[in-house]
């Protein structure tokens, strides 16, 4: 058993049929010695008396908020949560496996630039009685500070018969140099509680590996005289690290017909313009990627050819 | 990134072309190592990230763009110098990053060159003959060092009398390639910045 927050304790249980469970001794936080009674949650049934209460915790029915009282007055609370271990593996019931980029990916994180700011998100099908807390650091043995905000519900989607809820959090490394070469990864730890179930999830990454630039901005077409060709131009996204001559991007320009089956023409360039042939009813799209470190491509920025 | 790319102007800053070749070569070598040594811990997640130049050179600090010198987090151990020499800065009156930056890059290359050559000598003794260093990568390191045109004492190649542990050598190769790729990215950024200055 260990303390998660003040008066909130996590009982780690090996979860299998007829498991013996854990014996837990609760102590009432009071100088009083006599006339103390214990109740669970808001039931009036007295579970025991005295300054300590010993319970055998085997299942969720044994967890909850234990309260000690004296003469109708509440003295203290202890909330017991359960953390299940099945076949030596901690449960991951609360969050959904996103399976991208690999199996057992519960947390996904992205950064728009090298400023040390990043966003992580996760998915669940649980709609209520859910709470999260996020901690982060650079490295784990001698951790350097990363500050994370509160996790918030950022999207709701219908997936077949199920509703899916996306939560996200923004974090900022306390003293980040955009030009630094990372040797210690960022660690992100998410505590999740659903009803009386506790779980924790972790992710470890280098900012350079989670970079995904915003799409290029101000995408414009300029027709060339007496030609089916057009000059496409665009700019670096506002959120990208500066100076751009140091933090350079490379671009992919795509001409796509109305039908998805039509052949796509693609050009790769380091410049912020390109000359392409504009077909009728086609659209031109441009996306960006760090020129020197191949992390993710941005989403496409698009304009119609007409 | 095996994709068609519009080529840059040939009359550019002489070292940029070499640094681009360097990044391409080290990235290809790292990819080859990951594939060949698939049963060894050779991915970014599995290895310890060591920097053989740590406390010996200060490339990131010395080559910091002027715009980032206002960022206190970038200035921990920054030594500024505005002396310019070395053929890469030929005829460029720039107060950006000076000899200290380029000589720091040169020292990095020299250190990695020695390590890679020592390692390759060991790998050539491996009866499995599983992996060797790409000669193209070693040649590209050499070309960039020549373009930087700094004179410094030659570092003798390390020789070891004991029997090489090939497993450890291959893991060390992965660690070295990962670190060198990161440094090659920094070098490319610096050369691109200098080219635009």
């Amino acid at each position: 058993i260990w303390e998660l927050k003040k008066d909130v304790y996590v009982v780690e249980l090996d979860w299998y049929p007829d498991a013996p469970g854990e014996m837990v001794v609760l102590t009432c936080d009071t100088p009083e010695e006599d006339g103390i009674t214990w109740t669970l949650d808001q039931s009036s049934e007295v579970l025991g008396s005295g300054k300590t209460l010993t319970i055998q915790v085997k299942e969720f029915g044994d967890a909850g908020q234990y309260t000690c009282h004296k003469g109708g007055e509440v003295l203290s609370h202890s909330l017991l949560l359960l953390h299940k271990k099945e076949d030596g593996i901690w449960s991951t019931d609360i969050l959904k496996d996103q399976k991208e980029p690999k199996n057992k990916t519960f947390l996904r994180c992205e950064a728009k630039n090298y400023s040390g700011r990043f966003t992580c998100w996760w998915l669940t099908t649980i709609s209520t009685d859910l709470t999260f807390s996020v901690k982060s650091s650079r490295g784990s043995s001698d951790p350097q500070g990363v500050t994370c905000g509160a996790a918030t519900l950022s999207a709701e989607r219908v997936r077949g018969d199920n509703k899916e809820y996306e939560y996200s959090v923004e974090c900022q490394e306390d003293s980040a140099c955009p030009a630094a070469e990372e040797s210690l990864p960022i660690e992100v730890m998410v505590d999740a509680v659903h009803k009386l179930k506790y779980e924790n999830y972790t992710s470890s990454f280098f900012i350079r590996d989670i970079i995904k630039p915003d799409p290029p901005k101000n995408l414009q077409l300029k027709p060339l005289k007496n030609s089916r060709q057009v000059e496409v131009s665009w700019e670096y996204p506002d959120t990208w690290s500066t100076p751009h001559s140091y933090f350079s991007l490379t671009f992919c320009v795509q001409v796509q017909g109305k039908s998805k089956r039509e052949k796509k023409d693609r050009v790769f360039t380091d410049k912020t313009s390109a000359t392409v042939i504009c077909r009728k009813n086609a659209s031109i799209s441009v996306r960006a990627q760090d020129r020197y470190y191949s992390s993710s491509w941005s989403e496409w920025a698009s304009v119609p050819c007409s | 990134r095996n994709l068609p790319v519009a080529t840059p102007d040939p009359g550019m800053f002489p070292c940029l072309h070499h640094s681009q070749n360097l990044l391409r070569a080290v990235s290809n070598m790292l990819q080859k190592a990951r594939q060949t040594l698939e049963f060894y811990p050779c991915t970014s997640e599995e290895i310890d990230h060591e920097d053989i130049t740590k406390d010996k050179t200060s490339t990131v600090e010395a080559c910091l763009p002027l715009e980032l010198t206002k960022n206190e987090s970038c200035l921990n151990s920054r030594e500024t110098s505005f002396i310019t020499n070395g053929s890469c800065l030929a005829s460029r009156k720039t107060s950006f990053m000076m000899a200290l930056c380029l000589s720091s890059i040169y020292e990095d290359l020299k250190m990695y060159q020695v390590e890679f050559k020592t390692m390759n000598a060991k790998l050539l003794m491996d009866p499995k003959r599983q992996i060797f260093l790409d000669q193209n990568m070693l040649a590209v390191i050499d070309e960039l060092m020549q373009a930087l045109n700094f004179n410094s004492e030659t570092v003798p190649q390390k020789s070891s009398l004991e029997e090489p542990d090939f497993y450890k050598t291959k893991i060390k190769l992965c660690i070295l390639l990962h670190a060198f790729r990161i440094r090659a990215v920094t070098i490319d950024r610096v050369m691109s910045y200098l080219n635009a200055s």
Partner: nanobody, 120 residues
């Protein structure tokens, strides 16, 4: 912070029914238990019924079989269905929520109360 607002109280004849609602707003996190309490004039506040996060409900003997407790999770609302009302059920009814918000810790919140009067 968690706010609770009760509604549904009023004047009802003996033998009649009322349904009280308790709507929670704010960051309620994981609710560990919910209780309905009542306070008659000049008396102390007494527990009437409660529900825990395991779905167990408990009722005091004096309302057993007449009152039921339920929850609409989507609306963050709890209900107390009161049937076969008696004059002695006259009181101000309060809802009380206990829960855990990991960024804040344990919390408890009381509603402002709703008056129930059973009289002919």
């Amino acid at each position: 912070e968690v706010q609770l607002v009760e509604s549904g109280g009023g004047l009802v004849q003996p033998g009649g029914s009322l349904r009280l609602s308790c709507k929670a707003s704010g960051s309620i996190g994981s609710v560990t238990s919910m209780g309905w309490y009542r306070q008659a004039p000049g008396k102390q506040r007494d527990l009437v019924a409660s529900a825990d996060s395991n779905g167990r409900t408990t009722f005091q003997d004096f309302v057993q079989g007449r009152f039921t407790i339920s929850r609409d999770s989507a609306k963050n609302t709890w209900y107390l269905q009161m049937n076969s009302l008696k004059p002695e059920d006259t009181a101000v009814y309060y809802c009380h929520l206990r829960g855990l918000q990991l960024t804040m810790g344990l919390y408890e919140s009381w509603g402002q109360g709703t008056q129930v009067t059973v009289s002919s």
